[in-house]
Amino acid sequence: QGGTRSPRCDCAGDFHKKIGLFCCRGCPAGHYLKAPCTEPCGNSTCLVCPQDTFLAWENHHNSECARCQACDEQASQVALENCSAVADTRCGCKPGWFVECQVSQCVSSSPFYCQPCLDCGALHRHTRLLCSRRDTDCGTCLPGFYEHGDGCVSCPTSTLGSCPERCAAVCGWRQMF
């Protein structure tokens, strides 16, 4: 269309970058560069990332998409969010399991494995903090149980058993001699 004045672009901003001969507009997230633009400040030829690949950001030079990660079944990982053209698979642990980092300085990209959460109920204890990012935090013994060593012991149901100091305090009675 004769006479229309083209917008100025100088390759310096985020909008256009020099690709090949010209400053070109980049490809949107989820697309890769098939061919650079064929005129100044033109649109590059961009194609959607194929299945099982992604590109999370607008880009100017990526001529292929990144392969989606597979969650590590050996480490009991599951996919919390499936891979899309714009985002990688988000791996995590299924309900009742928690993330145990394999490195000391743990960040979101660190390798990890999934551990089953402690079942406080099975240990006859109160659940103080539910298991998600770390293991369950169990509290005191449930009613009808008292602390004995590392565990919770059921209150005696008859007078035949002995009931030490802690038992008596929790279970509410002392064996008569």
Epitope: T4, R5, I19, G20, T38, H61
Partner: antibody, heavy 123, light 111 residues
Framework: EVQLVESGGGLVQPGGSLRLSCAAS????????MSWVRQAPGKGLEWVST????????YFPDSVKDRFTISRDNSKNTLYLQMNSLRAEDTAVYYC????????????????WGQGTLVTVSS | DIVMTQSPDSLAVSLGERATINCRAS??????????MQWYQQKPGQPPKLLIY???NVESGVPDRFSGSGSGTDFTLTISSLQAEDVAVYYC?????????FGQGTKLEIK
Amino acid sequence: EVQLVESGGGLVQPGGSLRLSCAASGFTFSSYAMSWVRQAPGKGLEWVSTISDGDSYSYFPDSVKDRFTISRDNSKNTLYLQMNSLRAEDTAVYYCARDRIYGSVQYYAMDYWGQGTLVTVSS
Amino acid sequence: DIVMTQSPDSLAVSLGERATINCRASESVEFSGTSLMQWYQQKPGQPPKLLIYAASNVESGVPDRFSGSGSGTDFTLTISSLQAEDVAVYYCQQSRKLPYTFGQGTKLEIK
């Protein structure tokens, strides 16, 4: 003094292949985009291919796309044109040209040309 | 593709006279206020030579009798006073967008 010297032309049968070379001297080869332009006997000029400086992206018209490839070896100051699946209509003198960029407008003009090399496609 | 059409196809001009060659693009070759087109001269048996770039800028070493004008879609190459060595074919070419395209050429002869 800028010099461009083409070589590799000759007689080839239809369907055959040929690789043209262009030896450059007298300028910083790696800093320039480079082109091939052809001229059929008694006819006008036709752009065949361009390769960018730096990232070496290549460009072709539809008439040669998927048959020709352009490449460069900056360490040897040499431009190449690989021509496959040649046809009778590819018969022409092939010129190598330097593309000079003017100003900040991403505007190119071919400011130096070689003498050309003749490619004849015939059975 | 942008089609470049030159007129006339051939031209005969007397020595010392003005020669004018026209070139029309099928769409505008303007970008950011610059006309992305150039003129080449090709003498018999020689490669083309750049004469004019950006429609009106004379390449260094080219005699000042050569000039270019025009914008948008219509362009003119003018030789103010024809010399014997100006006998050649003249081509316009656009660099606005790929594929780069040339005019069909204008053959300039001496009358």
